[in-house]
Amino acid sequence: REAAPKSYAIRDSRQMVWVLSGNSLIAAPLSRSIKPVTLHLIACRDTEFSDKEKGNMVYLGIKGKDLCLFCAEIQGKPTLQLKEKNIMDLYVEKKAQKPFLFFHNKEGSTSVFQSVSYPGWFIATSTTSGQPIFLTKERGITNNTNFYLDSVE
């Protein structure tokens, strides 16, 4: 039986959700007028880059769109981007597609996503609404790197 990605709405402690704006992800307040993305999450079958202390290796995609999150260096800085790619195409690849991989770790009831390509860099939202989802190596006060994965039907 073929594996299927799990579906989640994603939210931070300030009740900000992820929203698709054009071809990028931004954080916006949970509200009736905003349509949050449903995140697709599926484990990577290849164990080449695995590190159990950092969490499970997963691919992250946007449900209903052929878009996946990936990490690339732009002007010397690790950057989070969306690439046109079906998450199941990544899953069926025998070899792990490193730029698309994230370590998914649980911290209490929250989830943390760390880039496999750039260890120490985490998916984050800023404290300001309408800002892009980004990668940071500074966890804490100004950046939020802990997310709630809410089940959606």
Epitope: R14, Q15, A28, S31, S33, D150
Partner: antibody, heavy 122, light 111 residues
């Protein structure tokens, strides 16, 4: 249909701890995406949010009360509770429990208990 | 002092239209968090009247409507009736407090 019912002592002595319980019926307290809150209303005054807990067990507290408040869940009894320590006469109020659901009520409270009056007096 | 500001009282004659304002800031209403309105009849618990700025739960008459613009929101009641006499509260979420906030309440008197 979800229903909430507050219970606890109606009289608490100053400096003691106020303890209230909210019993949830018609639904599970661990059901996905629900949040549960405590709100109070001093006699003749407005509503004040005390704090909340959600289905993940995450707690959120009013900064002005944070040092004195603890909210917890008892899944076996389908209840959530409020503890407010070091009470004074200013904590005399009707205490309500309420609930909402992320992605449906959008951080509002659509179900409320009927409220319970707690008086702080020696 | 409440985070959201409402007028303490408003009044109107039966059949008239009244509005109640709710003013917040850039960390709550102005940050695009929704505004919700509650009606509290004397001696009873608050009841959700409007959620998500302008949506009525089932059973709430269409005489009640909500709107939002910038850092403010308002509740309008048309065709005022004696049974509308109550306290009305607005509520939102404030990201700087990581919590829920209420207005101070508005007492509606039907003349």
């Amino acid at each position: 249909e979800l229903q909430l019912q507050e219970s606890g002592p109606g009289l608490v002595k100053p400096s003691e701890t106020l303890s209230l319980t909210c019993t949830v019926s018609g639904g599970s307290i661990t059901a996905s995406n629900y949040y549960w809150g405590w709100i109070r209303q001093p006699p003749g005054k407005g509503l004040e949010w005390i704090g909340s807990i959600d289905y993940t067990g995450s707690t959120y507290y009013n900064p002005s009360l944070k040092s004195r408040v603890t909210i917890s869940v008892d899944t076996s009894k389908n209840q959530f509770s409020l503890k407010l320590s070091s009470v004074t006469a200013a904590d005399t109020a009707v205490y309500y429990c309420a609930s909402g659901k992320y992605y449906e009520t959008y951080l509002g409270f659509d179900v409320w208990g009927q409220g319970t009056l707690v008086t702080v007096s020696s | 002092e409440s985070v959201l500001t409402q007028p303490p009282s408003v009044s109107g004659a039966p059949g008239q239209r009244v509005t109640i304002s709710c003013t917040g800031s850039s960390s709550n209403i102005g940050a695009h968090y929704d505004v919700h309105w509650y009606q509290q009849l004397p001696g009873t618990a608050p009841k959700l009247l409007i959620y998500g700025n302008d949506n009525r739960p089932s059973g709430v008459p269409d005489r009640f409507s909500g709107s939002k613009s910038g850092t403010s929101a308002s509740l309008a009641i048309t065709g005022l009736q004696a049974e509308d006499e109550a306290d009305y509260y607005c509520q939102s979420y404030d990201y700087s407090l990581s919590g829920y906030v209420f207005g101070g309440g508005t007492k509606l008197t039907v003349l």
